[in-house]
Interface confidence: medium
């Protein structure tokens, strides 16, 4: 806590500028008006304040806005954002995507901090759903963002937002998450033709039921092994040898490499040996 002391004569700040870097902490506290700071927040980032000086500036804003900062200030926090605690951020009402982008930019290249997680949570809750633009922004900064959400949170993602999802955004999703996302993707891409549809839906197939895999097997899709290995075991088990052969196309030869791993191992055990033999891969049920 900085002591309340009078500002020395002639030191009262008329604007936020570089001269303030020479102010001691107590001088900043005494000589910088909080309202001036709030209106000129955009200048703070251009000035090489020390961490201790930034603490003083934060303290002044906290005093001015005890109920939480207005968005006009939040948007220009810049590196001061790194000084905020999750408790501070919970008081905010962030509605502008530009504000969100500006603050994510500050944390760019780092792991998602508790502050960022709280900010995103506040933003999404404020919007009521994860719309496409928000999802685009969040996955650009944090490719694993989507898979960090619970199935319940994912249920608020509208199908239209699925267009913003890239394959790498789903890399760390577990089957429960894909179970939620797959029906949305199916709805989002339903008007695409066969081959284009498969390219788009491929990343989501870890949530696909058996009947959809059977339908895909009739469309000559040539699914690659990486995709096949991510399918739900319970969805793969009822597939016939002929259906798997059609689903994988030439990649069926790769089943040999995967015969000891799920879902291939479990699927093999469900098949008649005569049927497996038709593949010519030496698979033993």
């Amino acid at each position: 806590e900085v002591e309340k002391t009078a500002c020395p004569s002639g030191k009262k700040a008329r604007e936020i500028d570089e001269s303030l870097i020479f102010y001691k902490k107590w001088e900043l506290e005494a000589c910088v008006d909080a309202a001036l700071l709030a209106t000129q927040m955009d200048r703070v980032n251009a000035i090489p304040f020390t961490y201790e000086q930034l603490d003083v500036l934060k303290h002044k804003l906290d005093e001015l806005y005890p109920q939480g900062y207005p968005e006009s200030v939040i948007q220009h926090l810049g590196y001061l954002f790194l000084k905020m605690s999750p408790e501070d951020i919970r008081k905010w009402n962030v509605t502008s995507l530009e504000t969100l982008k500006a603050l994510l930019e500050v944390n760019k290249g780092h792991e998602m901090s508790p502050q960022v997680a709280t900010l995103i949570d506040r933003f999404v809750k404020g919007r009521g759903q994860l719309d496409k633009d928000t999802l685009d922004t969040l996955t650009a900064f944090y490719p694993g963002y989507l898979c960090s959400l619970s199935p319940e949170e994912l249920s608020s993602v509208p199908p239209s937002s699925i267009w913003a999802v890239r394959p790498q955004d789903l890399d760390t999703c577990d089957p429960r998450q894909l179970d939620v996302l797959y029906p949305k993707a199916r709805l989002a891409f339903q008007n695409m033709n066969g081959s284009e549809y498969f390219v788009k839906i491929q990343s989501f197939l870890g949530g696909a039921p058996t009947e959809d895999l059977k339908a895909l097997s009739q469309q000559n899709v040539s699914m690659d092994l990486a995709t096949f290995m991510k399918l739900r075991t319970d969805a793969v088990l009822p597939l016939t040898v002929a259906e798997v052969q059609k689903l994988l196309g030439p990649h069926v030869e790769g089943l040999k490499a995967e015969e000891r791993h799920r879902p291939v191992r479990d699927w093999i055990l469900r098949q008649r040996q005569d049927d497996l033999d038709t593949l010519g891969l030496g698979l033993q049920g």
Partner: antibody, heavy 115, light 107 residues
Framework: EVQLVESGGGLVQPGGSLRLSCAAS????????MHWVRQAPGKGLEWVAY????????YYADSVKGRFTISADTSKNTAYLQMNSLRAEDTAVYYC????????WGQGTLVTVSS | DIQMTQSPSSLSASVGDRVTITCRAS??????VAWYQQKPGKAPKLLIY???SLYSGVPSRFSGSRSGTDFTLTISSLQPEDFATYYC?????????FGQGTKVEIK
């Protein structure tokens, strides 16, 4: 006996086109995938394109996408690689290879792109 | 795209030597890795598929193994006809990718 024989290589100017053929014998092209793989002089192998005639699926390396087209005529048991907008960096020996495991290869045909 | 990083790029060995060539995938490719041998002016020949399965007609001195994303081709006792360039290749994802090659030369 399985055999793959490539043809159609030669000298072509930058921006020009060539069509390579891969005549297959000893197996039914319809039920096997086919690849084109190339090797620039003194360099390593680079996968170029793939077709599975059974399904019509095709895939391409990023370096040739939009310029090269792979196709197959199962009645002639022959795979093709249509190469348009050729560049100097496409100069290489082009091989066709059979199957997911690339178990059989042709002898290769040289494509030289030069002005 | 998946990168297959092969090492060494070349090695010198004598007849009878045990030779090991490694290939590291930039991400998991399971066991879907093949090894090929190529001699100057000739087409490549398949030696190993599915990381460790010996292709028919290939001498048993050739073997393949996998440890996570690391793949190894071993020639237990180098023969005169084994001096060539060796390539690994993954077929787990489109697009198929080859390693940059290892040239095995006579010491």
């Amino acid at each position: 006996e399985v055999q793959l024989v490539e043809s159609g290589g030669g000298l072509v100017q930058p921006g020009g086109s060539l069509r390579l053929s891969c005549a297959a014998s000893g197996f039914n092209l319809y039920s096997y995938s086919m690849h084109w793989v190339r090797q620039a002089p003194g360099k390593g192998l680079e996968w170029v394109a793939y077709i599975y005639p059974y399904s019509g699926s095709t895939y391409y390396a990023d370096s040739v996408k939009g310029r090269f087209t792979i196709s197959a005529d199962t009645s002639k048991n022959t795979a093709y690689l249509q190469m348009n907008s050729l560049r100097a960096e496409d100069t290489a020996v082009y091989y066709c290879a059979r199957g997911y495991g690339m178990d059989y290869w042709g002898q290769g045909t040289l494509v030289t792109v030069s002005s | 795209d998946i990168q297959m990083t092969q090492s060494p790029s070349s090695l010198s060995a004598s007849v009878g030597d045990r030779v090991t060539i490694t290939c590291r995938a930039s991400q998991s490719v399971s066991s879907a890795v093949a090894w090929y041998q190529q001699k100057p002016g000739k087409a490549p020949k398949l030696l190993i598929y599915s990381a460790s399965s010996l292709y028919s007609g290939v001498p048993s001195r050739f073997s393949g193994s996998r440890s996570g994303t690391d793949f190894t081709l071993t020639i237990s006792s180098l023969q005169p006809e084994d001096f060539a360039t060796y390539y690994c290749q993954q077929s787990y994802y489109w697009l198929f990718t080859f390693g940059q090659g290892t040239k095995v030369e006579i010491k």
